[in-house]
Interface confidence: low
């Protein structure tokens, strides 16, 4: 396929990846399902330096990113290495937490509004941030 | 222990705006959803929508077209308006937190007349 | 949307008797249900959450069973404060759907 040069329209360019925004909400498989969609994934955050330029364009405000611990362990969506990798949860925080009695514990990561990482139910419908690699293949090479 | 106080006009006739307030006390107001949920008279409950403090939403299809939730979080308070009422929106209308719907608000009746 | 079935829609029993109130619904919600009891001019209270834990300050005679598609809420012993209207309530999927409700009258 093809090599993606820039960003499409309407995404911001930073450090070679395209982030899209999102400005409404969706459950987190919904989110993630989106940004497929775009050949792309829910935003994976693997320095300091990315986290603050994603928490800057999101604000105050509750936005799933692509880590979820539904099948096991946590796992990033790019396959990138959890246990090795950037982390900011908030203390005391990934917790599971049952109490809220809604079915289950809480499986999927989100930054809160300081944008320190929480994890919570995947049914809400937070906002979510879309990313995918400059230079990265556009579309899946066929296969041989 | 957590306390929600719902209150707004009781009568409307047809086509008014029904406007309704909860206000949350105890507990977290940010932590959670914050749900509106009606049941006409003698008949069952209908879930309507839900906000959480950052403004994010989500409503029941067959009311969206009529439906806007909307949070206040510096009051703790939650808020629902739904326009073009007709009688068959005539129920007891009841705020109640996140979708597990662990406490409610106390009830108020809106009455659309003529 | 989910559809709830929620069954009997009314029932008559004496105090004492085991009571038993079943949902069905229309596509599995693994076990994301509650339930819920009103008296006349009141609330709902939520009884049973994730469809078989019972909330805190409910008398142990109610307890909650099932998974995917198919619940029970159970009154072991009915007394005279259970007559009541009883629904489920699913959180699986959005929009968020209630059973139609069963009432529980004295016999």
């Known amino acids: 396929g093809s090599e993606r040069t820039c960003c499409p329209v309407n995404w911001v360019e930073h450090e070679r990846s395209c982030y899209w925004f999102s400005r409404s909400g969706k459950a987190w498989a919904d989110a993630d399902n989106y940004c497929r969609l775009e050949d792309a994934h829910l935003v994976v955050v693997t320095s300091w330096e990315e986290q603050k330029f994603v928490q800057h364009h999101i604000g105050p405000v509750n936005t799933w990113m692509g880590l979820h611990d539904q099948n096991g362990p946590w796992k990033w969506v790019d396959g990138t290495d959890y246990e090795t990798g950037f982390k900011n949860w908030r203390p005391e925080q990934p917790d599971d937490w049952y109490g809220h009695g809604l079915g289950g514990g809480e499986d999927c990561a989100h930054f809160t509004d300081d944008g320190r990482w929480n994890d919570d139910v995947c049914q809400r419908p937070y906002r979510w941030v879309c990313e995918t690699e400059l230079d990265k293949a556009s579309q899946e090479p066929p296969l041989l | 222990q957590v306390q929600l106080q719902q209150w707004g006009a009781g009568l409307l006739k047809p086509s008014e705006t029904l406007s309704l307030t909860c206000a949350v006390y105890?507990?977290?107001?940010?932590?959670?959803?914050w749900t509106w949920i009606r049941q006409p008279p003698g008949k069952g409950l209908e879930w309507i929508g839900e906000?959480?403090?950052?403004?994010?939403?989500n409503y029941n299809p067959s009311l969206k077209s009529r439906v806007t939730i909307s949070v206040d979080t510096s009051k703790n308070q939650f808020s629902l308006k739904l326009s073009s009422v007709t009688a068959a929106d005539t129920a007891v209308y009841y705020c109640?937190?996140?979708?597990?719907?662990?406490?409610w608000g106390q009830g108020t009746l809106v009455a659309v007349s003529a | 949307d989910i559809q709830m079935t929620q069954s009997p829609s009314s029932l008559s029993a004496s105090v004492g008797d085991r009571v038993t109130i079943t949902c069905r619904a229309s596509q599995g919600i693994r076990n994301d249900l509650g339930w819920y009891q009103q008296k006349p001019g009141k609330a709902p209270k939520r009884l049973i959450y994730?469809?078989?834990s019972l909330q805190r300050g409910v008398p142990s005679r109610f307890s909650g069973s099932g998974s995917g598609t198919e619940f029970t809420l159970t009154i072991s012993s009915l007394q005279p404060e259970d007559f009541a209207t009883y629904y489920c309530l699913q959180h699986k999927r959005y929009p968020l759907t209630f059973g139609g409700g069963t009432k529980v009258e004295i016999k």
């Open positions: 105890g507990g977290s107001f940010s932590g959670y959803f």
């Open positions: 994730s469809a078989s």
């Open positions: 906000i959480n403090h950052s403004g994010s939403t």
């Open positions: 109640a937190r996140d979708y597990g719907a662990d406490y």
